[in-house]
Amino acid sequence: IWELKKDVYVVELDWYPDAPGEMVVLTCDTPEEDGITWTLDQSSEVLGSGKTLTIQVKEFGDAGQYTCHKGGEVLSHSLLLLHKKEDGIWSTDILKDQKEPKNKTFLRCEAKNYSGRFTCWWLTTISTDLTFSVKSSRGSSDPQGVTCGAATLSAERVRGDNKEYEYSVECQEDSACPAAEESLPIEVMVDAVHKLKYENYTSSFFIRDIIKPDPPKNLQLKPLKNSRQVEVSWEYPDTWSTPHSYFSLTFCVQVQGKSKREKKDRVFTDKTSATVICRKNASISVRAQDRYYSSSWSEWASVPCS
Amino acid sequence: RNLPVATPDPGMFPCLHHSQNLLRAVSNMLQKARQTLEFYPCTSEEIDHEDITKDKTSTVEACLPLELTKNESCLNSRETSFITNGSCLASRKTSFMMALCLSSIYEDLKMYQVEFKTMNAKLLMDPKRQIFLDQNMLAVIDELMQALNFNSETVPQKSSLEEPDFYKTKIKLCILLHAFRIRAVTIDRVMSYLNAS
């Protein structure tokens, strides 16, 4: 058993049918010695008396808010949560496996630049009685500071019969140098509590591996005289690291017809302009990627050929 | 990256072309190592990230763009010098171009070159003959060093009398390649910045 926060405790259970469970001793936080009784949750049934209460915790029915009283007055509370270990593996019931980039990916994180700021998100089908707490650091043995905000519900989607809820959090490394070569990964730890179930999820990454630039901005077309060709121009996104001559991007320019089946013409360039043939009803899209370290491409920025 | 690559202009900052080739070569070598050594811990998540140049060179600090010198987090051990003597700088004058930066890059290359050559000698003794260092990568390191044209004492190649542990050697190769790729990215960024200056 360990303390998650004041008066909230996590009991780790080897989870299998007929398991013996864990013996837990609760102590009433009071100078009083006599006339103390214990109850669980809203029930008025007295579970025991005395300053300490010994219980055998086996299932969720044994978890909950234990309260010690004296003469009708509440003295203190202890909330017991359960953390299930199923055949050596901690349970992952609360969050959905996003399966990208690999199986057992519960947390996904992205950064728009090298400033040390990043966003993580996760999915669940649970809509109520759900709380998250996020901590992060650079490295784990001698951790350096990363500050995370509160996790918030960022999107709701319908997937078949189920509703899916996306939560996200923003974090910022306390003293980040954009040019630094990372040797210790960022660690992100999410504590999830659903009713009386506790779970924790972790992700470990280098900022360089989760970079996804914003799409190029100010995408413009300039027709070339007496030609079907157009000059496409764009700019680096405002959120990208500076100076741009050091943090350079490379770009992919795509001409896409109205039909998805039509052949796509693609050009790769390090410049912020390109000359392409503009077909009728086609659109021109441009996306960006770090020129030197191949992390994710940005989303497309698009303009119609007309 | 398997994309069309534009060839640099002849008047371009001479080292940029070499540094681009270096990054391409080390990235290809790392990809090959990860495929060939698929049953070894060779991915970024699995290896220990060691930097053989740590405390010996200060490339990141010495080559920091002027715009980032205002960022206190980047100024841990920054020493600045604006005197230059490398041939890459022959045709450019700019306050950013520091001898310290380019000599630090040169020292990095020299250290990795020695490590890679020593490692290759061990890998050639492996009866499995599973993986060797790409000669192109070694040649590209050499070309960039020549372009930098710094005179420095030659480091003797390490020789070992004991029987090499090939498993450990292959893991060390992965660690070295990951670290060298990260340094090659920094070198490319620096050369791109200098080219624009």
Epitope: W15, Y16, D18, E59, E86, D87, G88 | P41
Partner: antibody, heavy 115, light 111 residues
């Protein structure tokens, strides 16, 4: 004590279907994940499928994916394995087992796929 | 479909020490715990070892398990006639929750 009683096995022709059941007692069935494991005559153990305690996630071995469906009815304390498009190589003793460090096994039920 | 490799058979005389190896990879034994089962003819497998080296109550202490890297082993110190059975190791595949992987099985013969 924990008990898993299996039923539904038998002889079936290739291409046909069969549904196995596993009735659980002696524990809170709705709190635990469950597996199906099979053993072909004279061969080793092969994992077939897993279902989470609440039925929300199901996982299958490649050899049965798209043909077998694991399901559970927590109100009836019963686990099922619906087997379609059966092949000769599906002939085996099928076991249901609880998920956990100490697992409990059913007595097994024989499925024979033969023309 | 067997991911974990065991020797097909091992034998020993009563009182001898018998060991069975189980070889896997980084995604199974390398990152998950190992179990061992004993199966007597015509019966369901019985759990002998869980969590690499833990014995459930009721299992004689002559059975012991260990794990190192991507391999595991079961030792029977002072093998007895009633230990003649098939033995299977089992782990999980890290890439897929709930996906149990079994060993090829080892027949233990007491001479």
């Amino acid at each position: 004590q924990v008990q898993l009683v299996q039923s539904g096995g038998g002889v079936v022709q290739p291409g046909r279907s069969l549904r196995l059941s596993c009735a659980a007692s002696g524990f809170t069935f709705s709190s635990y994940g469950m597996h199906w494991v099979r053993q072909a005559p004279g061969k080793g153990l092969e994992w077939v499928a897993f279902i989470r305690y609440d039925g929300s996630n199901k996982y299958y071995a490649d050899s049965v994916k798209g043909r077998f469906t694991i399901s559970r009815d927590n109100s009836k304390n019963t686990l099922y394995l619906q087997m379609k498009s059966l092949r000769a190589e599906d002939t085996a003793v099928y076991y249901c087992t609880t998920h956990g460090s100490h697992d409990n096994w059913g007595q097994g039920t024989m499925v024979t796929v033969s023309s | 479909s067997y991911v974990l490799t065991q020797p097909p058979s091992v034998s020993g005389t009563p009182g001898q020490r018998v060991t069975i190896s189980c070889s896997g990879g980084r995604s199974n034994i390398g990152s998950n715990t190992v179990k061992w089962y004993q199966q007597l003819p015509g019966t369901a497998p019985k759990l002998l070892i869980y969590g690499n080296d833990q014995r459930p109550s009721g299992v004689p202490d002559r059975f012991s398990g260990s794990k190192s890297g991507t391999s595991a082993s079961l030792a029977i110190t002072g093998v007895q006639a009633e230990d003649e059975a098939d033995y299977y190791c089992q782990s999980y595949d890290s890439s897929l929750r709930g996906s149990r992987v079994f060993g090829t099985g080892t027949k233990v013969t007491v001479l």
